[in-house]
């Protein structure tokens, strides 16, 4: 099920989800000068079974003054330089989808995307955050969102991160002792069924994954 | 909580104009997708309008293009359609709705405009 | 254009029965297919996404299936505030079309 909001904003932190479930969405988002072709898809899906899985639909580009002509190719490196969306810029590959069932890896970039990725995520979705670069994580707990099912509906669980203006940038994910958490939500359900799924094997993978450059930056 | 007014409906002549706006509230508009949809008095449901976050991307279906405007301030979280040349096939309550993933996810309550010698 | 029919303007059915409500694309849309649910006096809710995820909210007694032209919205255990309106709409291709909808009577 879709969750109905995005993951919570953190200041100076960025968010990143290390592999994405069955039924979110990837919106085509073209940069400006550019608009989506006529018949082109609105957004890539992740899709398959738990065997298995990959992004559904392409996303093309075409340039807004000239509709004629519609790109899909891989974007050159010196194009790569001024996009800052949600991909991993580390030499490191996100992870297989096949040490993750029913999940999708990073969709490749497609040329004249937008500088800023949107995903809408389903149930059950983690994202880790990071500080960026020039801030340091502070008095930190899990730095980590679940969009929970929780009374019928979806929400967030509060990251506890505090990025603080000083010019060392934290490693990730978890290099540090969690200390006091800062005020949040409360994570404790008493009355209802709370929806959860695959949360301890994307944070086991994430425990062993080096540390990666986020770009992404979260308005 | 995502909330979509509409206001501006009424009744105008064939051959009339109309402007219809939607106040937005409730989430990031300005970095939304946002479009018209509008449903006729027999129930069919028909979009009508569909505009980009940064309102340099609009569509239409050929029925209304030409006579019907899509615009946005999103310094005032504000959707806006602008009519003319209006038929009496254009009878219908008009609704705004948010892109989130899909282009009519969210909708709101509509306003209905009549037209009518 | 295509056209997105559905050919049962009016089902009825008993809770807790289990109805299927049916959308024919007139050609192929992959699974860019989406329900929507107006209950009497209220805007369109949407239900499902890409032909068969469930939209945030939904009961998961709604369920969507098929792909390319034939698609279904089958309901499990219906309940009495299922009484609605139900729409399917392509988004694959411009125009975005709607079906004329089939409504569902609880008997």
């Known amino acids: 099920e879709l969750c109905d909001d995005d993951p919570p904003e953190i200041p100076h932190a960025t968010f990143k989800a290390m592999a994405y479930k069955e039924g979110t969405m990837l919106n085509c988002e073209c940069k400006r000068g550019f608009r989506r072709i006529k018949s082109g898809s609105l957004y890539m899906l992740c899709t398959g079974n738990s065997s298995h899985s990959s992004w559904d639909n392409q996303c093309q580009c075409t340039s807004s003054a000239t509709r004629n002509t519609t790109k899909q190719v891989t974007p050159q490196p010196e194009e790569q330089k001024e996009r800052k969306t949600t991909e991993m810029q580390s030499p490191m590959q996100p992870v297989d989808q096949a040490s993750l069932p029913g999940h999708c890896r990073e969709p490749p970039p497609w040329e004249n995307e937008a500088t800023e990725r949107i995903y809408h995520f389903v149930v059950g979705q983690m994202v880790y955050y990071q500080c960026v670069q020039g801030y340091r994580a502070l008095h930190r707990g899990p730095a980590e969102s679940v969009c929970k099912m929780t009374h019928g509906k979806t929400r967030w669980t509060q990251p506890q991160l505090i990025c603080t203006g000083e010019m060392e940038t934290s490693q990730f994910p978890g290099e540090e002792k969690p200390q006091a958490s800062p005020e949040g939500r409360p994570e404790s359900e008493t009355s209802c069924l709370v929806t959860t799924t695959d949360f301890q094997i994307q944070t086991e993978m994430a425990a062993t994954m080096e540390t990666s450059i986020f770009t992404t930056e979260y308005q | 909580e995502v909330q979509l007014v509409e206001s501006g409906g009424g009744l105008v002549k064939p051959g009339g104009s109309l402007k219809l706006s939607c106040a937005a509230s409730g989430f990031a508009f300005s970095s939304i997708d946002m479009s018209w949809v509008r449903q006729t008095p027999e129930k069919r449901l028909e979009w009508v309008a569909y505009i980009s976050s940064g309102g340099d991307n609009t569509y239409y279906p050929d029925t209304v293009k030409g006579r019907f405007t899509i615009s946005r301030d999103n310094a005032k979280n504000t959707l806006y359609l602008q009519m003319s040349s209006l038929k009496s096939e254009d009878t219908a309550v008009y609704y705004c709705?948010?892109?989130?993933?899909?282009?009519?996810?969210?909708w709101g309550q509509g306003t209905l405009v009549t037209v009518s010698a | 254009d295509i056209v997105m029919t559905q050919s049962q303007k009016f089902m009825s059915t008993s809770v807790g029965d289990r109805v299927s409500v049916t959308c024919k694309a007139s050609?192929?849309?992959?699974?860019?297919v989406a329900w929507y649910q107006q209950k009497p006096g209220q805007s369109p809710k949407t239900l499902i996404y890409s032909a068969s995820y469930r939209y945030s909210g939904v009961p998961d007694r709604f369920t969507g299936s098929g792909s390319r032209t034939d698609f279904t919205l089958t309901i499990s255990n219906v309940q009495s505030e299922d009484l609605a309106e139900y729409f399917c709409q392509q988004y694959n291709s411009y125009p975005w079309t709607f079906g004329g909808g089939t409504k569902l009577e609880i008997k």
């Open positions: 709705a948010r892109r989130y993933g899909l282009p009519f996810a969210y």
């Open positions: 050609q192929n849309v992959g699974t860019n």
